[in-house]
């Protein structure tokens, strides 16, 4: 079964800059999975942000402008990266990655 690890316990960024969060997949080939990213803001329910499927198709949450989040998958390092553009106070949250095995 697949296992996920988010090596960055926390990340601090300057406003308007770019943040990159990593999710390392082990126990399964990342190219055979779909990786989902969610965020949980303080006091709010968890929210889907973006996903990248086994075939590379990206899907995003409709309420968020299309350029805000970027998701990538690097098979060589078995890592999925969530890039947050134009970091703002509303981005303060806990970010989770999740795996769907095909």
């Amino acid at each position: 079964a697949g296992h996920l690890e988010q090596p960055q316990i926390s990340s601090t960024k300057t406003l308007s800059k770019t943040a990159r969060l990593e999710c390392v997949v082990s126990g399964i080939t990342i190219s055979a999975t779909s990786v989902y990213w969610y965020r949980e803001r303080p006091g709010e329910v968890i929210q889907f942000l973006v996903s990248i499927s086994y075939d590379g198709t990206v899907r995003k949450e409709s309420g968020i402008p299309s350029g805000k989040f970027e998701v990538d998958r690097i098979p060589e390092t078995s890592t999925s990266t969530l890039t947050i553009h134009n970091v703002e106070k509303q981005d303060i949250a806990t970010y989770y990655c999740a795996l769907w095995e095909v």
């Epitope: 590379g56 198709t57 990206v58 899907r59 995003k60 949450e61 409709s62 309420g63 968020i64 402008p65 299309s66 350029g67 805000k68 970027e70 998701v71 990538d72 890039t83 553009h85 134009n86 703002e88 509303q90």
Partner: antibody, heavy 116, light 107 residues
Framework: EVKLVESGGGLVKPGGSLKLSCAAS????????MSWVRQTPEKRLEWVAS???????YYPDSVKGRFTISRDNARNILYLQMSSLRSEDTAMYYC??????????WGQGTTLTVSS | DIVMTQSQKFMSTSVGDRVSVTCKAS??????VAWYQQKPGQSPKALIY???YRYSGVPDRFTGSGSGTDFTLTISNVQSEDLAEYFC?????????FGSGTKLEIK
Amino acid sequence: EVKLVESGGGLVKPGGSLKLSCAASGFTFSSYAMSWVRQTPEKRLEWVASISSGGSTYYPDSVKGRFTISRDNARNILYLQMSSLRSEDTAMYYCARDGYPPFDYWGQGTTLTVSS
Amino acid sequence: DIVMTQSQKFMSTSVGDRVSVTCKASQNVGTNVAWYQQKPGQSPKALIYSASYRYSGVPDRFTGSGSGTDFTLTISNVQSEDLAEYFCQQYNSFPLTFGSGTKLEIK
């Protein structure tokens, strides 16, 4: 049927201000990100501003500090307040439904001309 | 900023032919590319998203392909109503950017 109708365009002198509106119907407006895109007289498309369903705003450097995008989810209206207008802001302004999939519906556009 | 280059400003084709419009991104944008059609006097209409997915109601003669930096919009069995300008766009990251457009002319 999704419908986006822009209004508010016109002729403005350099340095002037103008507010554009976009009335949305046919979908749950409050659930979608929205954007403004302009088309220059040379027919180039340029992204102008985006706003999330929750009100977070995003701009390219070319309009940052001069343009403000906002929304009224109760009335299903998207706005673009423009100030310190320049001749290079002359364009057809379109509102578009953003989010995912992006820019799937566009309005018919409203024209802004900045000239003395 | 990511530059989207459509090197062909004009393309000429005949009804029934197959034509390919190309777009090159200045850096990797994955599959975060959309294509739009703009007919004379009209606003842009969405054709393709995620590089290869057709928007609802778009005829299946329109096909998108590519990933990374190179993208193609192929129109098979070209119809007279396909006379239009075609724009690519990347939505991988801000600022969102568009190609300069390729105008399709029907012989």
